[in-house]
Amino acid sequence: HAPEDPSDLLQHVKFQSSNFENILTWDSGPEGTPDTVYSIEYKTYGERDWVAKKGCQRITRKSCNLTVETGNLTELYYARVTAVSAGGRSATKMTDRFSSLQHTTLKPPDVTCISKVRSIQMIVHPTPTPIRAGDGHRLTLEDIFHDLFYHLELQVNRTYQMHLGGKQREYEFFGLTPDTEFLGTIMICVPTWAKESAPYMCRVKTLPDRTWT
C-alpha cells in the first residue's frame, strides 16, 4: 500500500539537553496508539552506520537517554526513532544535527548564601555534568566552557540592586544594613555560546548588630 505520512505516527523528534544530559524525545502522531512501540538509533555525524540504542528498542515511553552515546563534546550526532503501530504500520523520523556544546541549556547554579552582619557572602559550587574525564572524574561546566561567568545580583530595595560577577566562585556584597532581608539571584552565563541559566534565588537576612546591645 502507499506509504502514509510519517507524522501520522511520529512527531517532534528532538534532543532536549540540559547540563549535557542529552535526552531524545518525541510525540506520537494522530494515528499513534498506546501500544505503538518505538526503537531508537543514533550515529556520529560523518559515520555511515546507525547504532541501535540498547534499552530503547520496542519501548512504549516517548524518551530515551542518549547522554553516554552523545558524550563527546567535539562530535556532532543524529538520532532517529522508528515507530511501529500494533497494525504493523511504521514510520521513521530523524533529529536535526545535534551538538551538545551548542544545544545544551544551563540549569541554575548551586549556591550557598551566607548571612553576616553587614554583608552577604555567596559561594557558587561548580556544576557537575554527566561527562567523564579520562581520570573518571565528572567534568564541571567550568571545565568545559573557558568563558563561563557567574552573574550575581542583590536586590536591596525596589529601586536599587547591587551587582557582582566574574569567573570566581566566591563573592561578597558589603555595606549592607544589619537585620535586613535581601533577595539574591545568581546566574551562569556563557556569552560566547549565548547561554544563560535560569537564576538561583536566595532570600537572606543580614544578622542583627549585637554590638549596640
Partner: antibody
Framework: EVQLVESGGGLVQPGGSLRLSCAAS????????MYWVRQAPGKGLEFVSV????????HYVESVKGRFTISTDNAKNTLFLQMNSLKSEDTAVYYC??????????WGQGTQVTVSS | DIVMTQSPSSLSVSLGDRVTITCQAS????????LAWYQQKPGQSLKLLIH???RLQTGVPSRFSGSGSGTSFTLAISGVEAEDLATYYC?????????FGQGTKVELK
Amino acid sequence: EVQLVESGGGLVQPGGSLRLSCAASGFTFSSSWMYWVRQAPGKGLEFVSVINTRSGITHYVESVKGRFTISTDNAKNTLFLQMNSLKSEDTAVYYCATRIQGLIDYWGQGTQVTVSS
Amino acid sequence: DIVMTQSPSSLSVSLGDRVTITCQASQSIGSVNALAWYQQKPGQSLKLLIHGASRLQTGVPSRFSGSGSGTSFTLAISGVEAEDLATYYCLQDYAWPLTFGQGTKVELK
C-alpha cells in the same frame, strides 16, 4: 606556594620545531585552565593557547592554529607546547600561566624562543 | 577578536603624581566587566593589580584603583611611588582569545 617553571626554549631555524615545558606545583594542576602567553621583543603580550587539564578542551589564537599543540601530563604536573613550522614572527619570550580561583594570577618567568636562520 | 586600545603608550611622571591610563575595548566585555590590569617590570612576569574592572587584588596597595564598564576602562595610581615605575597592561578576560592592550610604560621625568 604556586610555582610555574618554563623550559625548552632556544634558537631554531624557520620551519623547525620546538617543545616547551612548564613544570607546575603548589596547586591542583589536574583541574585547572593552563595558558601559554608570548611576548615578542619590544611588542605586546599575546595569549597563544589554553587547555583545561581535566577535560582536555583546548583553544588557540588564529595565528598558531595547525602549527602549535598544547597538551599536559597530569601525572607529572607538566604543561607542554609543541611548536612546529616555526616562523620568525614566533620569536618571543613564552610564559605559562594558570587561572586559580577565577583569576589569571600566576605566571612563570618565561623561556626565550628565537626563530632565525 | 576583541581589540584593546590602551593609551597613552608612555607616561613621564614625577613621584607623587596621579596617573591615569585608559583602555578601550572594541566591543562590550559584558556586565561582569571582565577586565584586569597587570604590572610588568623589566625582566619579570606579570603581576595582577585589578580584576573585574575595579576590584583590587589582595596585597596590592590601595593607591591603585580601577573603574569603568562596557567598553571604557581606567587604571589610576593616586600617588606614584618609585616601585610603580613599570609597564601596565589591560586584559579582557571576556572571550577567547583573551587580548591585552599594547601597554603603557610609566617612567620618571
